[in-house]
């Protein structure tokens, strides 16, 4: 009789875990910024501290009647989803509630900021174990709310936020759009995006993953033993906050970057029907449903990577897009994508001591995306080698010339606007191991890394006939670090990574006029980390 | 995720001199004013004044006080509702939108954001 949502996110081998661990043994603390809550509810009694924090706007309307059970409804349900005795994800976790939403579920950016500051002060006054902050709220894009989240995240706090229920791009809302926050969209029992009336879950590149958020049974504030179903991205975020709490209670030293990477890596993949999302958002939205990952002891030193999309560059001629990894992550490769195919490629550059992935729009293009592959590579030392464009008719080759450095990604950037020069040479010279082979008139950038036991290899797949996309996957045990379209057909839209799959996209019109000799090639660089081995390039 | 989304950023037209008052030497305002793109969610009259990252504790208080003093000279009463020290330097202020130009010219100010609603999801 386990509720569907818990069954979905907690694999069978974890389901008896609670009963083996002493109650309340976890030192993890979850802070919930929401409505007031009913602390005496059976689900959460004894695990919840209702702080004296209260920063809410007045309720609207002169005839508004404050009814305690209604005022507490949203927060009580979420507290139950996180740590409820019976329907909670992290049953032993202690929770602190801060009231930032009024009885109508409305709050302010300023009230939320003061709440976040309250948490920071508590942290300074009495340092404790790992902290998770659940933000089951959303407002319009706010630079300061995002900045506050960034500052708090940099103190080691893990923030989890609702993507929003506006059936819209999550990047238009805060705190959902803050990169340092784990942003969660909502799915139903069929693993499909949640519809809420005429609206539904938000989507897009600012969503990290999805979690159950429809008809979630949890504590009802109507009475101390009442239960009810609620739906929304708040419920989804509460599931992920619970998962994070469980991960941290097992391994308190996990960092935000490790937590996010593990959540992504161990999530259920490709079950969401992407057709629900607007067409232009489908490629940007992660097809991931959260599940509780195994501990790092059980999974060894896997190489973990995720794909980070930039904002759209906009259509101006010199528009650039920038994708960034989290501070702890290594940028192992950079690619670009444009729906019109008019792009001048991508490159990696250092900005303020951090490597960033850049993409450049071309004249007449509708804009580009930069696509960064961000990885956790312990003790990595990475650098970029680039070669200016070669003379017409020649290819450019770049390889990793430092000892024990392996190639993890290639980028190509054209100095010229004329797309027609990017023709594949009649004969492509045989690729040397660990080399980036450039298109004509392209500057080539090689991402080279040294890390204990890091080994990489290239995998190519070419299609000569008509095809909208070419894909190549890294096999089990290997992780995709780089993905490119190799000097190929007349017009490619670009390349990007979806989990362990490298996708090279071709323009529809380019398919018809392609000659059989012009194969579109998707090139994947696949790496793995074997701590005992030396860094090497595998042929 | 860090680019500004559908977000209003306004550079207010500012006079180079503040009513010619001697102690208020011209300060070129590089600070911007930001507000929610959804009009119904805006809370005009309440503003979060965000100061430069390295602003010291005392400077935060001085900036808030300076704003109060300069507003008073113009016949406006403003209320500092909260001072942010621990997460970022800044303060929350209740004031007329007429004073935004003045506030943006204060030293240490990086940007000012109009308060707005957030909602349970």
């Amino acid at each position: 009789s386990i509720p569907w949502n818990l069954e979905r996110i907690i694999p069978a081998w974890h389901q008896t875990e609670e009963d083996r661990s002493p109650d309340g043994s976890s030192q993890v603390e979850v802070y919930l910024l929401d409505t007031s809550i009913q602390g005496a509810h059976r689900e959460i009694e004894g695990r919840v501290t209702i702080t004296d924090f209260n920063s809410v706007p007045e309720e609207d309307g002169t005839r508004f009647h404050r009814q305690a059970s209604k005022c507490d409804s949203h927060g009580t349900h979420l507290a139950g989803v996180v740590s409820g005795r019976d329907a909670g994800v992290a049953k032993g976790t202690s929770l602190h509630s801060l009231r930032v939403l009024n009885c109508q579920g409305k709050g302010t950016v300023s009230g939320t900021l003061i709440g976040l500051e309250f948490i920071r002060k508590s942290q300074l006054i009495q340092p404790s174990g790992p902290l998770v902050v659940l933000l089951p709220l959303a407002g319009g894009y706010s630079r300061i709310l995002n900045a506050a989240c960034r500052h708090l995240a940099r103190t080691g706090v893990v923030l989890v936020a609702a993507a929003g229920n506006f059936r819209d791009d999550a990047c238009l809302y805060s705190p959902a759009s803050a990169p340092e926050v784990i942003t969660v969209g909502a799915t139903n029992a069929q693993d499909q995006p949640v519809t809420l009336g005429t609206l539904g879950t938000n989507f897009g590149r600012c969503v990290d993953l999805f979690a159950p958020g429809k008809d979630i049974i949890g504590a009802s504030s109507d009475c101390s033993t009442c239960f009810m179903s609620q739906s929304g991205t708040s419920q989804a975020a509460a599931h992920v906050a619970g998962i994070v709490a469980r991960m941290l209670s097992r391994e308190p030293t996990l960092t935000l970057a490790e937590l996010r990477q593990r959540l992504i890596h161990f999530s259920t993949k490709d079950v969401i029907n992407m057709a629900w999302f607007p067409e232009d958002q489908q490629v940007l939205t992660p097809n991931l449903v959260a599940t509780l990952p195994p501990s790092t002891h059980e999974t060894g030193g896997q190489l973990l990577c995720r794909t980070v999309w930039s904002a759209h560059s906009g259509p101006t001629r010199t528009a650039t897009a920038t994708a960034r990894c989290a501070p702890e992550e290594e940028l192992l490769s950079c690619s670009s994508f444009s729906r019109s195919g008019r792009r001048r490629g991508d490159w990696i550059e250092a900005i303020g001591g951090q490597q960033v992935c850049k993409a450049l729009n071309a004249f007449g293009g509708e804009g580009v995306y930069a696509v960064a592959r961000c990885c956790l590579v312990p003790r990595a030392n990475c650098s970029i080698h680039n070669t200016p464009a070669a003379r017409a008719g020649l290819e450019t080759h770049v390889h990793c010339h430092q000892k024990d450095h392996v190639l993890t990604g290639c980028s190509f950037h054209w100095e010229v606007e004329d797309l027609s020069v990017r023709r594949q040479p009649a004969l492509r010279s045989r690729r040397q191991p660990g080399q980036c082979v450039g298109h004509q008139a392209a500057s080539v950038y090689a991402s080279c890394c040294h890390a204990p036991g890091l080994e990489c290899k290239i995998k190519e797949h070419g299609i000569s006939g008509p095809s909208e996309q070419v894909t190549v996957a890294c096999e089990a045990g290997w992780t995709l670090t780089g993905c490119n379209v190799l000097p190929g057909a007349s017009l490619t839209l670009g390349a990007y990574s979806v989990d362990n799959l490298c996708v090279a996209r071709v323009h529809d019109t380019a398919r018809a006029d392609r000659t059989s000799g012009e194969a579109t090639v998707a090139a994947a660089i696949c790496c793995r980390s074997r701590p005992s081995a030396k860094a090497s390039w595998v042929q | 995720q860090d680019e500004d989304g559908d977000y209003e950023e306004l550079m207010l037209a500012l006079p180079s001199q503040e009513d010619g008052l001697a102690d208020e030497a011209a300060h070129v305002a590089t600070a911007t004013f930001r507000r929610c793109s959804k009009e119904a969610w805006r809370l005009p009259g309440t503003y979060i004044v965000v100061l430069m990252e390295e602003t010291q504790r005392l400077q935060i208080e001085q900036t808030a006080h300076r704003l109060q003093t300069r507003a008073a000279r113009r016949g406006y009463v403003i209320k500092v509702l909260h001072i942010f020290y621990d997460l970022f330097p800044g303060f929350l202020v209740k004031m007329s939108s007429d004073l935004l130009g003045l506030a943006l010219k204060l030293p240490h100010v990086e940007y000012i954001e109009e308060d707005s609603f957030v909602f349970a999801q």
């Epitope: 009963d19 509810h41 059976r42 689900e43 009475c223 033993t225 009442c226 239960f227 | -």
Partner: antibody, heavy 118, light 107 residues
């Protein structure tokens, strides 16, 4: 598996006290409330009170408030119900029952028969 | 205290019959109602929780419905092993109160 094992039958004189125990196993003892419910011969079920084993907090039915005491010993995962000033109408089967918040009283002890007779 | 009025107090039905028992609360109890089965000399067994949710391992012929003040318990096709006394119970507030029970017999 979850088990609640109660102490054996008791025969008491009017005015005396009885202390019934209920030993829990197969789950985290402090995570779930324990209730006491009694049933007089040929009658229905009557709720006496509850204890939260985590902190020891109790909540009694007004009817029994002056005579009942519920305690717990977390080291042995045992709860106790003591009823004082016994009278003949207290003759009943006394059950302990675990409450899972979502699932109500999902596990019950086998019952302890208390007979009050002079 | 919240009163739970159960009806009928006893009923006789044939194997295969559809049996319905009702329970009326003296005030709104949301969906915080459970149904139990008790066989002679045994402890009660949980069948339905939160008004309509079947507990683990309970056969699908048992169902519950209702919210607020009116609740119904149904056995869709009576089996010989279903002979017992059935109780409703409100979990909305303390003191917890039970209905007086419905004794079910086979015709």
């Amino acid at each position: 598996q979850v088990q609640l094992v109660q102490s054996g039958a008791e025969v008491k004189k009017p005015g005396a006290s009885v202390k019934v125990s209920c030993k829990a196993s197969g789950y985290t003892f402090t995570s779930y409330y324990m209730h006491w419910v009694r049933q007089a011969p040929g009658q229905g079920l009557e709720w006496m009170g509850e204890i939260n084993p985590s902190g020891g907090r109790t909540n009694y039915n007004e009817k029994f408030k002056s005579r009942v005491t519920m305690t717990r010993d977390t080291s042995t995962s045992t709860v106790y119900m003591e009823l004082s000033s016994l009278r003949s109408e207290d003759t009943a089967v006394y059950y302990c029952a675990r409450e899972r918040p979502l699932h109500a009283m999902d596990y019950w002890g086998q019952g302890t028969t208390v007979t009050v007779s002079s | 205290d919240i009163q739970m009025t159960q009806s009928p107090s006893s009923l006789s039905a044939s194997v295969g019959d559809r049996v319905t028992i009702t329970c009326k609360a003296s005030q709104d109890v949301h969906t915080a109602v459970a149904w139990y089965q008790q066989k002679p000399g045994k402890a009660p067994k949980l069948l339905i929780y939160s008004a309509s949710h079947r507990y683990t391992g309970v056969p699908s012929r048992f169902s519950g419905s209702g919210s607020g003040t009116d609740f119904t318990f149904t056995i869709s096709s009576l089996q010989p092993e279903d002979i017992a006394t059935y109780y409703c119970q409100q979990r909305y507030s303390t003191p917890r109160t039970f209905g007086q029970g419905t004794k079910l017999e086979i015709k």
